[in-house]
Interface confidence: medium
């Protein structure tokens, strides 16, 4: 599924991401935009042999199990394919674990490079939340 901007903002808010660990909803929507272009089925392969999955591009070396990433930790204890569902529950629950890990949203390269320090509230402007 490819979410609309406001549709995703509403879904993320419903799942408790607004101000989760101090990160406003705009940060999460911005991260999703630049990680996956709001596409729940996005997959991208990394040079270390791992793969990033889903709307928040969660990595198989650390967070999920895709059955083929050497030394996978699977810290979210889920199959990576669950992160590709049109229901973002699994991605949100795993993202909450990631953002609580110590580096906050810096764990997402796209957030660090494209969202951090910008007017992230623009990503939810005009949305009925």
């Amino acid at each position: 599924k490819v979410f609309g901007r406001c549709e995703l903002a509403a879904a993320m808010k419903r799942h408790g991401l607004d101000n989760y660990r101090g990160y406003s909803l705009g940060n999460w929507v911005c991260a999703a935009k630049f990680e996956s272009n709001f596409n729940t089925q996005a997959t991208n392969r990394n040079t270390d042999g791992s793969t990033d999955y889903g709307i928040l591009q969660i990595n198989s070396r650390w967070w999920c199990n895709d059955g083929r990433t050497p030394g996978s930790r699977n810290l979210c204890n889920i199959p990576c394919s669950a992160l590709l569902s049109s229901d973002i529950t699994a991605s949100v629950n795993c993202a909450k674990k990631i953002v609580s890990d110590g580096n906050g949203m810096n764990a997402w390269v796209a957030w660090r490079n494209r969202c951090k320090g910008t007017d992230v509230q623009a990503w939810i402007r005009g949305c009925r939340l």
Partner: antibody
């Protein structure tokens, strides 16, 4: 136990298309990548690409882009590879395998012969 | 693409001999290297994963070693059922690639 059952041998004319199937049993089909491998005598094994059945995500070896197309039907736990514009160079045994990085589980292979 | 070069192309041995098969990668692939045996008209069979981890059911005479670019499959005291083709495969990056194979034949 994990099993991959491929469709039977095919004899096709040059220029035609063929669709090979790979039915998976014994594991959660949507969770693992299915990979496709080509074997020709004297050419060893070549990785064609992969599909994640749960999402339909695909990756192709550059060499096979435009030649192979992967699909999957999660209702029947079956992956498919279509090969188009067949030539004699496509005559080979084609294997599906479960993508664990390594390949512990293989289909029995589908022999494709392209001949006029 | 990562190229895997296997040597020798053919190895002629007598049952009871011990042999070493080589697989060399064109760049470092850590331990992401796997070994297969293939008999005529059969699918490949995984022997060793991640350079040195023997798969369940594989006889202990098979062992793997190496890391980086140089890998070895050793067969201690070859048995008649061991004859066939041996391939290495890397999973360090895409596209996945295989070596050209080593044919183990009876002398």
């Amino acid at each position: 136990q994990v099993q991959l059952q491929e469709s039977g041998a095919e004899v096709m004319k040059p220029g035609a298309s063929v669709k090979i199937s790979c039915k998976a049993t014994g594991y959660t089909f949507t969770t693992y990548w299915i990979e496709w491998v080509k074997q020709r005598p004297g050419h060893g094994l070549e990785w064609i690409g992969e599909i994640l059945p749960g999402s339909g995500s695909t990756y192709y070896n550059e060499k096979f882009k435009g030649k192979a197309t992967f699909t999957a039907d999660t209702s029947s736990n079956t992956a498919y590879m279509q090969l188009s514009s067949l030539t004699s160079e496509d005559s080979a045994v084609y294997y599906c395998a479960r993508g664990d990085g390594y390949y512990c589980y293989w289909g029995q292979g589908t022999t494709l012969t392209v001949s006029s | 693409d990562i190229e895997l070069t296997q040597s020798p192309a053919t190895l002629s041995v007598t049952p009871g001999d011990s042999v070493s098969l080589s697989c060399r990668a064109s760049q470092s692939i850590s331990n992401n290297l796997h070994w297969y045996q293939q008999k005529p008209h059969e699918s490949p069979r995984l022997l060793i994963k991640y350079a040195s981890q023997r798969m369940s059911g594989i006889p202990s005479r098979f062992s793997g070693s190496g890391s980086g670019t140089d890998f070895t499959l050793s067969i201690n005291s070859v048995e008649t059922e061991d004859f066939g083709m041996y391939f290495c495969q890397q999973s360090n990056s895409w596209p996945r690639t295989f070596g050209g194979g080593t044919k183990l034949e009876i002398k």
